[in-house]
């Protein structure tokens, strides 16, 4: 029998800036019934505070309710585990939670096959940002990502959409099912999982041709020409 | 509208016992730190013991500690404060305060009228 | 514990006329973590500024925090009626404390 080993805190996630939940790894047991506490202080602070919130992030978490996010300061944090034959403290963890964004997939994506008469057919797409971002405060800037395969293809082609909530695509294979998915990520943080798959039919009669892989302004219409060339470079086969 | 009623002062001999009530209405109570801050007659403001919302650690400045409870009970919106061994120095009026956010050493944004806590022999 | 002065103890000035109230901590204090008060003769206290320089909802823009590390100020641009009180300072980095209180009374 012997203390427990030093814990580990090895994430820490929010999903809007709002509220956000750190988790961490036990160390080994040490063969006895461990107890693990969090404790932490926001940078510039003397006090101590202990996790207000052991539950809703499931086991081996803390969670910081809305009352217990703050935007603009560093929290210092650490997990103490502790057994009858003595205790082990994890190293101490900054947080920020501007860094540590990782948003839900955004909603409503709608995919349809266009064929204007007197344009090139496209693939266009459309979504809706996660509902627990507000994009109205400034705080965020939202950026997105679309990939789509065909259903029995193993690759998916990737495509990056700058922070347009629409998108076109040109170069298809017709007569093909596609499978079409859309993720997002704040300025700084992480992408969100992808969207649940949307399947669209492209039909048999669809135009396509090399020049048409080319992404003009012009194809890619008015609202997204702002698009960089850097997002252009993103704009290649995976 | 947001407020903080106090109930429970009064006169009391030095070494005897007050409980303290505050009511808390307006607003979400069990998202705020709250704190108990006391002025003595014509002098400046102590603050004399708080706590965070879910009811974590108590804190107290030393002049109460071991004397003074602090308690809250967010379902009835309700804060307390047991006072013990009361001596003449903690005769003052006792404000109930809320804390901006969820911590109670925070900016205190909302102050009750005060109850009025009298120690004499 | 975190001591604070404040100075000076009295400021006699006439309405219109611009008040610059100090508050010294005997140890650093992050600026996220310094409030202003005032305090009307019978009234309770009412929050002013917070994070050393932000305005709590209601508070007229005459009022402004600024400082640093140890030394804070609270600068009201013009004097109002209300504004002949006592003025306190709080930290809230460590246990809160408040500053003995500077009072404002007409010249």
């Known amino acids: 029998q012997l203390p427990p080993g030093k814990p580990e805190i090895f994430k820490c996630r929010s999903p809007n800036k709002e509220t956000f939940t750190c988790w961490w790894r036990p160390g080994t047991d040490g063969g006895l019934p461990t107890n693990y506490s969090l404790t932490y202080h926001r940078e510039g602070e003397t006090l101590m505070h202990e996790c207000p919130d052991y539950i809703t992030g499931g086991p081996n978490s803390c969670h910081f309710g809305k009352q217990y996010t703050s935007m603009w300061r560093t929290y210092v944090m650490m997990v103490n585990a502790t057994n009858q034959m003595g205790s082990s403290f994890s190293d101490e963890l900054y947080v920020d939670v501007t860094y540590i964004v990782q948003p839900d997939p955004p909603l409503e994506l709608t995919v349809e096959v266009k064929q204007p008469e007197d344009r090139k057919p496209y693939l266009w797409m459309k979504w809706s940002p996660p509902t627990l971002i507000d994009l109205k405060t400034g705080w965020f800037t939202l950026l997105y990502e679309i990939r789509l395969k065909p259903e029995k293809a193993a690759e998916w082609e990737t495509h990056f959409a700058g922070q347009q909530t629409e998108f076109k695509i040109l170069s298809l294979h017709p007569g093909q099912k596609y499978l079409v998915q859309v993720r997002c990520k704040p300025d700084h943080g992480y992408w969100s999982a992808w969207s649940p798959a949307t399947f669209i039919q492209i039909p048999s009669d669809f135009i396509m041709n090399d020049e048409q892989k080319l992404i003009s302004e012009e194809d890619l219409g008015g609202e997204q020409k702002l698009i960089s060339e850097e997002d252009l470079h993103h704009h290649h086969h995976h | 509208e947001v407020q903080l009623v106090e109930s429970g002062g009064g006169v009391v001999r030095p070494g005897g016992s007050l409980r303290l009530s505050c009511v808390g209405s307006?607003?979400?109570?069990?998202?705020?730190?709250m704190n108990w801050v006391r002025q003595g007659p014509g002098k400046g403001l102590e603050w004399v013991s708080g706590?965070?919302?879910?009811?974590?650690?108590?804190n107290y400045a030393e002049s109460v500690k071991g004397r003074f409870t602090i308690s809250r009970d967010n379902a009835r919106n309700s804060l307390f404060l047991q006072m013990n061994s009361l001596r003449a120095e903690d005769t003052a009026l006792y404000y109930c305060v809320r804390g901006r956010s969820g911590w109670f050493n925070d900016a205190f944004d909302v102050w009750g009228p005060g109850t009025m806590v009298t120690v004499s022999s | 514990e975190i001591v604070l002065t404040q100075s000076p103890g009295t400021l006699s000035l006439s309405p219109g006329e611009r008040a610059t109230l100090s508050c010294r901590a005997s140890?650093?204090?992050?600026?996220?973590?310094l409030a202003w008060y005032r305090q009307k003769p019978g009234q309770t206290p009412r929050l002013l500024i917070y994070?050393?320089?932000s305005r709590a909802t209601g508070i007229p823009d005459r009022f402004s925090g600024s400082g640093s590390g140890t030394d804070f100020s609270l600068t009201i641009s013009r004097l109002e009626p209300e504004d002949f009180a006592v003025f306190y300072c709080?930290?809230?980095?460590?246990?809160?404390?408040f500053g003995p209180g500077t009072k404002v009374d007409i010249k």
């Open positions: 994070g050393t320089s």
């Open positions: 709080q930290q809230y980095a460590g246990l809160p404390t």
């Open positions: 140890q650093t204090i992050n600026s996220n973590y």
């Open positions: 706590f965070n919302w879910n009811g974590g650690s108590t």
């Open positions: 307006g607003f979400s109570f069990d998202d705020h730190g």
